[in-house]
C-alpha cells in the first residue's frame, strides 16, 4: 500500500513539476526590467526565451519573436535546449510512468518489469528536474552578471547634459516558476525511485516449496500465467490465471511466481 | 463614435473642491486609461495624471499628488478629477483624454473652465 | 522630470513651404525593449482641445494628412510640414509619452507668413 501511494504521488508530484517546466519555458518574463529607481514606468520590459515584450501604460503590449537563431547569445540558446530537453525527458518520464503505475493493470506485465519502468521514469524525472534547475540557474546568473555590468555604466552622457538610461533586467517570475517546478520533478523522481525498491520482487521470500502427494500432476492451463495444481474437484485450491479482468485485491494477493498451498 | 463629454464650467472660490466629470461613450470604458492635462490660459499643456478604469489604478504628476484625486465609475462610464484646496493658479481650462498605443492620447474632450475667485 | 525643450518657439512659414519643428528632451526617449521612440506630437488649434498628430516619434495616427511627418531618435526630434496649408496653422506640442510624469514642450506656434 505504502509502494503505490510513494508511486502515484510521485507521479502526480512530477507531473505537476513538468507541467511547471512546461509554463516557464513558454513565458515570457524570464527576465523583466528593474523598477527599483523608477518604481512607476510609463513603459515596462519584459523578456522570455522566445520573445521580447513591451507593455506601455496605455494597457497595449508588443511582443517581437526572436526571429534569429544565430544572432542570439549562446547562453540564451543553451537555457531553451535544457528546457527543451527537460521538458521531453519529463514527457517520456510520465509515459513510462503511466504504464509503471501498480493500480493500472497492462495485460501481463509482471512487477519486475513495473519496477524497471518506475526506476527509469524516476531516473528521467530526476534529470529532467536538473535540466530545468539548470536552465533556470544559468539564465538568472546571466542576468546578475548583465544587471552589473549595465549598473557600472548605468548612465553615459553627453557633456553631463543628456542622459541615456539603460534598461536593467532582473529576475522575472518564469525563473521562480521554473526553480519550483524543477524541484517537484526531482522530488517526483526520486519518489519513484524509492517506490521502485518497494516494487521490485524479492526473491528470498518466496523459497518455500510446496510438497504435494505423489502422483498429483501439474497442469498448465494455455495461455495462462501461473501453474494450478490439480486436487481433483477441489477448487479451493486450484487458481488458473487466465489474464482476464482481475480486482485490485487480487492483484495484491499474488506477489510472486509461485502458488502457495 | 468615440467621444469624451465633460461637465459643464465651474466657478470656486479659494480653498474649496471642485469635481469634474468625463463620460466616456463609443468604446469599451475599461479597455483605456484616462489621462487629465490642465492647460492655462495661453500656455502649454501639463498632464495631472491617469486612471486605469478597470482596477482604478492611479498615477500623478508630484506636482498634483495630493491634491487631485482621479476615479472611475465603470457601470457609468465615467472619470473624475477632485482637485481640492483650490487657488488662483488652479484657474484654467482642463482636459481628460483617452491613451492608446504608443502612450498617446487619441481622443480629448471640448475641456471644462475653473475659475479660481474670490 | 524629462524636460521637453521646442524650438522655435514661433515660426512663420508661407504657404506651400516646408515648415521644420524640432523638439528635445533630456533624456532619451528610445525604449531598448522594442526600439520604439515613445515621442508624440499634438496640434492645438484656437479654442479647440490637442488633436494627435504622430506617435513612437514617426507613425502617424490614422486621419492625418501624409504632409505631416515625424523623425529623431533618442532626444532629438523634428516635425515637418512638406507643404503648409492654411489650416495647419495651430500651435504644436512634442511629449514624452516613456516615463511619468508625462511632460509636454512649451509648444510652437506655427503662423502664416
Known amino acids: 500500500m505504502a509502494v503505490t501511494a510513494c508511486q502515484g504521488l510521485g507521479f502526480v508530484v512530477s507531473l505537476i513539476g513538468i507541467a511547471g517546466i512546461i509554463a516557464a519555458t513558454c513565458m515570457d518574463q524570464w527576465s523583466t526590467q528593474d523598477l527599483y529607481n523608477n518604481p512607476v514606468t510609463a513603459v515596462f520590459n519584459y523578456q522570455g526565451l522566445w520573445r521580447s515584450c513591451v507593455r506601455e501604460s496605455s494597457g497595449f503590449t508588443e511582443c517581437r519573436g526572436y526571429f534569429t537563431l544565430l544572432g542570439l547569445p549562446a547562453m540564451l540558446q543553451a537555457v531553451r535546449a535544457l528546457m527543451i530537453v527537460g521538458i521531453v525527458l519529463g514527457a517520456i518520464g510520465l509515459l513510462v510512468s503511466i504504464f509503471a503505475l501498480k493500480c493500472i493493470r497492462i495485460g501481463s506485465m509482471e512487477d519486475s518489469a513495473k519496477a524497471n519502468m518506475t526506476l527509469t521514469s524516476g531516473i528521467m524525472f530526476i534529470v529532467s528536474g536538473l535540466c530545468a534547475i539548470a536552465g533556470v540557474s544559468v539564465f538568472a546568473n546571466m542576468l546578475v552578471t548583465n544587471f552589473w555590468m549595465s549598473t557600472a555604466n548605468m548612465y553615459t552622457g553627453m557633456g553631463g547634459m543628456v542622459q541615456t538610461v539603460q534598461t536593467r533586467y532582473t529576475f522575472g517570475a518564469a525563473l521562480f516558476v521554473g526553480w519550483v517546478a524543477g524541484g517537484l520533478t526531482l522530488i517526483g523522481g526520486v519518489m519513484m525511485c524509492i517506490a521502485c525498491r518497494g516494487l521490485a520482487p524479492e526473491e528470498t521470500n518466496y523459497k518455500a516449496v510446496s510438497y504435494h502427494a505423489s502422483g498429483h500432476s501439474v497442469a498448465y492451463k494455455p495461455g495462462g500465467f501461473k501453474a494450478s495444481t490439480g486436487f481433483g474437484s477441489n477448487t479451493k485450491n486450484k487458481k488458473i490465471y487466465d489474464g482476464g479482468a482481475r480486482t485490485e485485491d487480487e492483484v495484491q494477493s499474488y506477489p510472486s511466481k509461485h502458488d502457495y498451498v | 463614435q468615440v467621444q469624451l463629454v465633460q461637465s459643464g464650467a465651474e466657478v470656486k472660490k479659494p480653498g474649496a473642491s471642485v469635481k469634474l466629470s468625463c463620460k466616456a461613450s463609443?468604446?469599451?470604458?475599461?479597455?483605456?486609461?484616462i489621462n487629465w492635462v490642465k492647460q492655462k490660459t495661453g500656455q502649454g499643456l501639463e498632464w495631472i495624471g491617469e486612471?486605469?478604469?478597470?482596477?482604478?489604478?492611479?498615477y500623478y504628476s508630484e506636482k498634483f499628488r495630493g491634491r487631485a484625486t482621479l476615479t472611475a465609475d465603470k457601470s457609468i462610464s465615467t472619470a473624475y478629477m477632485e482637485l481640492s484646496s483650490l487657488r488662483s493658479e488652479d484657474t484654467a481650462v482642463y482636459f481628460c483624454?483617452?491613451?492608446?498605443?504608443?502612450?498617446?492620447?487619441?481622443?480629448w474632450d471640448q475641456g471644462t473652465t475653473v475659475t479660481v475667485s474670490s | 522630470d524629462i524636460v521637453m525643450t521646442q524650438s522655435p518657439s514661433s515660426l512663420a512659414v508661407s504657404l506651400g513651404e516646408m515648415a521644420t519643428i524640432n523638439c528635445k528632451s533630456s533624456?532619451?526617449?528610445?525604449?531598448?525593449?522594442?526600439?520604439?521612440?515613445?515621442l508624440t506630437w499634438y496640434q492645438q488649434k484656437p479654442g479647440q482641445p490637442p488633436k494627435l498628430l504622430i506617435y513612437?516619434?514617426?507613425t502617424r495616427e490614422s486621419g492625418v494628412p501624409d504632409r505631416f511627418s515625424g523623425s529623431g531618435s533618442g532626444t532629438d526630434f523634428t516635425l515637418t510640414i512638406s507643404s503648409l496649408q492654411a489650416e495647419d496653422v495651430a500651435v504644436y506640442y512634442c511629449q514624452n509619452s516613456y516615463n511619468y510624469p508625462y511632460t509636454f514642450g512649451q509648444g510652437t506656434k506655427l503662423e502664416r507668413k
Open positions: 463609443g468604446y469599451t470604458f475599461t479597455s483605456y486609461v
Open positions: 483624454a483617452r491613451l492608446r498605443r504608443g502612450n498617446a492620447m487619441d481622443y
Open positions: 513612437w516619434a514617426s
Open positions: 486612471i486605469h478604469p478597470r482596477g482604478g489604478n492611479t
Open positions: 533624456q532619451s526617449l528610445l525604449n531598448s525593449g522594442n526600439q520604439r521612440n515613445y
